[in-house]
């Protein structure tokens, strides 16, 4: 459950984030699971731990394996696992499936291709972009921040796109490449004011004190690829990240689905070890797109033990 697959190429930088999160002030210890050997924090090592991040500078095939991260706070420990695989560089142009990040879809109106995992690295613009191993040239292609924009998208633009950038660590530069497929949809889509399917407005969710609870915010935004759409959770009108309660975490990344042709997103809020004070909070599911924002509010209530009468 708290395991994450990460992969990279030999002689490139690879940075992995611990799947368990905590406050920046919490210490994170990393271990190589097979040997239970602690990963050093000294930056002179090729592989070293830096808080929530595990850095391979550069990576070697022999680094492959499962790494354990333990987030330590004064009151609890949380364990996560990073399953790291380092592959040899391919001699030919083809990028094998196991090196591909998630496929993204585009349309004439929306043609952003984000460079996967780039936010983990210390990089500077511009990014280099390649399609099927050919450097992208021409005014239709614009490298903007961490994504590529393609103007006047055509079906021929479908293919595998690779971003290449330089990670800088203490003055040393390391190359990083990441590839994902891009598909083009030529269906006529539409966008509408967000519709929240779950939770219901002012829903009361029963939870058990001391147990874990999940809340799912699910909304639909129209048909086809949506230019801007997001779902997120708030606590008492505050962003989850600003609220500062590590037991309550938003799932990283939004799951996209197409329900009856509609483009929908969902975001799970995980509450670990439910406490009495959690029942006093307002949990806001927010769904937003270009048309506007819709909010549904949930409150938690204590689930009463069922009485068994004969």
């Amino acid at each position: 459950k708290f395991s994450k697959q990460s992969w990279g190429l030999e002689n490139e930088a690879l940075i992995v984030r611990c799947p368990r999160q905590g406050k920046p002030s919490y210490t994170v210890d990393w271990y190589y699971s097979q040997t239970n050997k602690s990963i050093p924090t000294q930056e002179r090592n090729r592989v070293f731990a830096s808080g929530q991040l595990l850095k391979f500078l550069p990576a070697a095939v022999a680094d492959s394996g499962i790494y354990t991260c333990i987030v330590r706070s004064p009151t609890f420990n949380r364990t996560g696992y990073a399953n790291v695989t380092i592959y040899k560089k391919q001699s030919d142009c083809n990028v094998p499936d196991y090196l591909m990040y998630s496929t993204v879809s585009g349309s004439e109106k929306n043609s952003k291709i984000y460079c996967p995992t780039i936010d983990l690295y210390n990089w500077t613009a511009p990014l280099e972009w390649f399609k099927n191993c050919q450097a992208l040239q021409g005014s239709r292609y614009r490298a903007h921040k961490s994504f590529l924009v393609i103007d006047n998208v055509m079906t021929e633009d479908a293919g595998d796109y690779t971003c290449k950038f330089i990670h800088n660590e203490n003055g040393a530069n390391y190359s990083v490449t990441a590839t994902r497929s891009f598909t083009v949809k030529d269906e006529q889509g539409f966008s509408l004011f967000p519709v929240i399917g779950a939770p219901a407005q002012n829903e009361i969710k029963e939870v058990e004190i001391g147990k874990n609870a999940n809340l799912t915010c699910s909304a639909c935004f129209g048909k086809g690829t949506q230019f801007l759409a997001a779902v997120l959770w708030q606590l008492n009108g505050t962003k989850i990240t600003d609220f500062g309660e590590p037991r309550i975490q938003q799932e990283e990344g939004q799951n996209q689905s197409f329900s009856n042709g509609l483009a929908c997103l969902d975001m799970v809020l995980r509450i670990a070890d439910v406490k009495e004070e959690d029942l006093l909070l307002q949990y806001d599911c927010l769904a937003l797109n270009l048309h506007g924002l819709r909010r549904h509010t949930v409150r938690l209530s204590r689930k009463n033990p069922i009485d068994h009468h004969s």
Epitope: F193, Q201, L232, Q234, N236, G237, T238, K239, Q282, D284, L286, L288, H291, G292, L293, R294, R295, H296, T297
Partner: nanobody, 118 residues
């Protein structure tokens, strides 16, 4: 509202709207304007909880809506003003579940006049 006035084309103004009597969180707040003989139109809207903003196409890139939680104040920074921006500008707020340029707002200010001459 405050901060209205007369300005030359290309100039700037900053409108302020001080909210009182309610918490500043979980509100949809916006700026609207009404020119003589025209319908009131949405200019910019902000959801206070997460700084999500919406702008009318006519002001995108020129106007910026922002908030100061501590002062419970909403702002509209207007740059590169044009004569067609001349209007009575209203601040509005709503605590309902929707936020956007097209929604109905429950609370309205008195308005402040902005005049842009060429």
């Amino acid at each position: 509202e405050s901060g209205g006035g007369s300005v030359q084309s290309g100039g700037s103004l900053r409108l302020s709207c001080a909210a009182s009597g309610y918490t500043f969180r979980r509100y949809c707040m916006g700026w609207f304007r009404q020119a003589p003989g025209k319908e009131r139109e949405g200019v910019a809207v902000l959801y206070t909880g997460v700084d999500i903003t919406y702008y009318a196409d006519s002001v995108k890139g020129r106007f910026t809506i922002s908030q100061d939680n501590a002062k419970k104040t909403l702002y509209l920074q207007m740059n590169s003003l044009k004569p067609e921006d001349t209007a009575l500008y209203y601040c509005a707020a709503d605590s309902g579940p929707l936020c956007g340029l097209g929604i109905q707002f429950g609370y309205w200010g008195q308005g402040t006049q902005v005049t842009v001459s060429s």
